[in-house]
């Protein structure tokens, strides 16, 4: 039975050209995390494997940095980075848990005025 829950940084906004940290945390389960996949829409951004460590997809290696922890740092943000991001926790024996973050990348002047998502 899957008892765990994933907490995320929620719905966030960031400034064009800046950086953002995507964070997920799996709680309420004793299952072993074997791998965490980070996806943007249907594209794989990065993998953190418990045994093999981090792998960043070649097409994102210039703008994606591993960490902190099991999180992911996106750099040199563009408006095209707006969208959904998923953290997919592969665990044993529970199975797969998925968390979702929606990122809006704002023009600098908008971001400076504190536009933020409302967390549901």
């Amino acid at each position: 039975m899957m008892t765990g829950t994933i907490e995320t940084t929620g719905n966030i906004s960031a400034e064009k050209g800046g950086s953002i940290i995507l964070q997920c945390h799996l709680s309420s389960t004793t299952a072993q995390v074997t791998q965490v996949n980070w996806e943007q829409q249907d594209q794989l951004l990065a993998i953190c494997n418990a045994d093999l460590g981090w792998h960043i997809s070649p097409s994102f290696k210039d703008r994606v940095a591993p960490g902190p922890g099991l999180g992911l740092t996106l750099q040199s943000l563009t408006v095209n980075d707006t969208g959904e991001y998923f953290c997919i926790y592969h665990t044993y024996p529970d199975g797969t848990y998925t968390g979702r973050i929606f990122l809006e990348v704002l023009e600098s002047s908008v971001a400076e005025h504190g536009a933020r998502f409302q967390i549901p």
Partner: nanobody
Amino acid sequence: QVQLVESGGGVVQPGRSLRLSCAASGPSFSSYPMGWFRQAPGKERESVAAQSSDGRFTYYADSVKGRFTISRDNSKNTLYLQMNSLRAEDTAVYYCAARDSGSGYYSRAQWYDYWGQGTLVTVSS
């Protein structure tokens, strides 16, 4: 409880257009992120398009980009999918889905709370 009813499906020749509608019951339609999904015979359900509750954010699957347009009319509690340049591979049952609340669009089926019964689109010459 939200009820979703799709309409507008049918048989159409390749290259032609169709517009699907999804009528929603419920008082808070304007707060629902919504999406269109489809399932072809013998295949898994896949996302087609999705839109945030305020219409600011839109998602399209790569296979329909530039051909399909999702839109909504909050005054009519209706979601639309305009499908142009239809292809045989677009043949499927199309489902409308809604989520109670949330920010941005939701491209994956697991996040939706309510589903319609579907409308069949057949693209054939």
